[in-house]
Interface confidence: low
């Protein structure tokens, strides 16, 4: 999946299986990529686990899991906020669009999270204070926590390059750049700048992510997705300076 | 770079709202934020070797347990509780009839609430 | 008061080695780094280094690595500095200066520059 | 050569303002909270003017302001006053580097 880091990096990673996106004092995030075609190098998320830790009087220990074609409206003890602590309406799901737009806000940390099923795929989005996010009990042992850290080098994949080198080339692929097996000819280049031209019209990294997801696996719900991503970012990024990023922004993990 | 002391002091300041001489009746408060800087820098030591902002950091801590007459021993303070920002519009602070520190501590006394953002999608 | 008080003017031969030292006063020593400036003539400042007298740690100036060496006496609250290898290009004043505590970074007191003459 | 740029020089008469720009990288300006200036006069040690970017010591006359946008920091000394003419020097710490900028020369014409 495309990724934005809490400091704004972009990056495409092939990770595959269980990752943890967040994971400090309060809240752990974990995602289950899977390859989007048989052989594929390129990943989309399948499964999305959010915990939120018992705090103080506020709220219970509650989990948030979703999965492809399952985008619940509640935890999974079947409640909508925090339990029966004093504040537990500090916590709360919001079902936004039923199977398809779930909000979850956890106030007494001042944190918003956004999750989304867009086609097969689900997506991911939230606002943080710093402080929730380096509230850590010890930096040594932080392991590879990918909204902080990126990707590791190694499971990242230079689309941009990918981008750059389809350009123009209409129908024709180069294979070498793919990091997917072809997707289906009818699928040319020109059609997927089109298609993602219609929703994202600045060609930022999110269009070209748009772009690149397209000629990887001909499904348009892609489009959607970078589209509903951008969003998310206007509701939740603070700086709106910010919000469209375009230059090379990729970078070693752990910066 | 590993070392995290610039997150300990951001911490630090932010708890004690950048006063430099707390009033005599804040003492309480100011050693327990004393506590929780010394920890916070405890815990990225390792990492901080010949850093000289961790060093200013260790002393200044010191410096001032002393002159506030800080014991080493005592409470810390909630990690950053009192101190986050907002939660952002005034609809999710209306909602919820209890008044708890749950709620207490997103009233608003920051100007620049340091929101940061991260999202994940598509392949 | 607060001071900074460096040893008198060096001159040197090209090889040799310098030993500057600055007496602190009028503060708790270990509380504060000590960094050492140095500055050519009609040059800008130039940073070389820092010592924590409260641990001994040091963070030298990568170009400098190798040749200088920064060292405390707590018992005299006295930093210094020692360059060897010394070349013309090393001839400076060399300035000591006291580290703002806590989480601030600034060099609050100066001494008053101890100038080194590096000549065959 | 600095890894911060100042610009040589700068002037202004008695009561004008003066901006001295100080340019880095964004790990040396941008990200740093840690950036002071210093004011030296010739012969003589230098002096902190200002440190965390806006702040001033007591005994620095609030005619010296510092604010800090992207990867430059600036020091403004406003209704400029004879004694203010020296050499004045940006700093910024980010990590294990410390970095003095060039030096700018301000001149009361």
């Known amino acids: 999946p495309h990724l934005r880091t809490f400091t704004d990096r972009f990056q495409t990673c092939k990770v595959q299986g269980a990752w943890p996106l967040i994971d400090n004092n309060y809240l752990n995030v974990q995602v289950t990529n899977t390859p989007v075609l048989p052989g594929s190098a390129a990943t989309a998320t399948s499964k999305l686990t959010i915990i939120f830790k018992n705090f103080q009087e506020c709220v219970d220990q509650k989990v948030y899991q979703a999965e492809m074609d399952e985008l619940p409206a509640a935890f999974v003890d079947g409640s909508k906020n925090g339990g029966d602590k004093h504040g537990a309406n500090s916590l709360k799901i919001t079902e936004k669009v039923s199977g398809q737009h779930v909000e979850i806000r956890a106030k007494y940390i001042g944190t918003t999270i956004v999750v989304r099923q867009v086609g097969r795929y689900l997506t991911f989005a939230v606002r943080v204070p710093e402080e929730v996010v380096n509230a850590v009990e010890d930096w040594d042992s932080q392991g590879l926590y990918l909204c902080l850290r990126g990707c590791p080098l190694n499971q990242q994949i230079d689309f941009q390059a990918f981008h750059t080198n389809t350009e123009g080339t209409g129908a024709r692929r180069l294979a070498a750049a793919s990091p997917a097996p072809t997707a289906p000819e009818t699928f040319p280049y020109e059609t997927a700048v089109a298609k993602c031209k219609e929703k994202l019209p600045v060609e930022d990294l999110y269009y070209q992510a748009c772009v690149f997801d397209l000629l990887t696996t001909g499904d348009v719900n892609f489009t959607l997705a970078a589209y509903y991503a951008l969003e998310d970012v206007k509701m939740l990024h603070s700086n709106k300076d910010k919000l469209h990023l375009y230059e090379r922004t990729r970078d070693l993990p752990g910066r | 770079s590993p070392c995290k002391i610039l997150k300990c002091n951001s911490e630090f300041w932010s708890a004690t709202s950048g006063s430099h001489a707390p009033a005599s009746d804040d003492t309480p408060e100011f050693c327990a934020a004393l506590r929780s800087y010394a920890l916070c820098t405890r815990r990225t030591a390792r990492t901080c070797r010949g850093d000289l902002a961790y060093h200013s950091a260790v002393h200044g801590i010191e410096d001032l347990m002393s002159q506030h007459n800080c014991s080493k021993d005592g409470p810390t303070s909630q990690p950053r509780l009192h101190t986050l920002p907002p939660a952002g519009d005034s609809q999710e602070r209306s909602d919820s009839p209890e008044i708890c520190h749950c709620e207490k501590s997103f009233h608003k006394h920051s100007a620049t609430p340091n929101y940061t953002h991260c999202g994940l999608f598509g392949d | 008061e607060v001071q900074l008080v460096q040893s008198g003017a060096e001159v040197k031969k090209p090889g040799a080695s310098v030993k500057v030292s600055c007496k602190a006063s009028?503060?708790?020593?270990?509380?504060?780094?000590i960094s050492w400036v140095r500055q050519a003539p009609g040059q800008g400042l130039d940073w070389m280094g820092w010592i924590s007298p409260y641990s001994g740690n040091t963070n030298y100036a990568q170009k400098l690595q190798g040749r200088v060496t920064m060292t405390t006496d707590t018992s005299t609250s006295t930093a210094y500095m020692e360059l060897s290898s010394l070349r013309s290009e090393d001839t400076a004043v060399y300035y000591c200066?006291?580290?703002?505590?806590?989480?601030?970074?600034?060099?609050?007191?100066w001494g008053q520059g101890t100038l080194v003459t590096v000549s065959s | 050569q600095s890894a911060l740029t100042q610009p040589r020089s700068v002037s202004g008469s008695p009561g004008q303002s003066v901006t001295i720009s100080c340019t880095g990288t964004s790990s040396s300006v941008g990200d740093s909270i840690y950036v002071s200036w210093y004011q030296q006069h010739p012969g003589k040690a230098p002096k902190l003017m200002l440190y965390?970017?806006?702040k001033r010591p007591s005994g620095v006359p609030d005619r010296f302001s510092g604010s800090k946008s992207g990867n430059t920091a600036s020091l403004t000394i406003s209704g400029l006053q004879a004694e203010d003419e020296a050499d004045y020097y940006c700093l910024s710490y980010a990590g294990t580097d410390t970095l003095f900028g060039g030096g700018t020369k301000v001149t009361v014409l």
């Open positions: 200066a006291r580290v703002g505590s806590g989480p601030y970074y600034y060099m609050d007191v």
């Open positions: 009028g503060y708790t020593f270990t509380s504060h780094g």
């Open positions: 965390d970017v806006t």
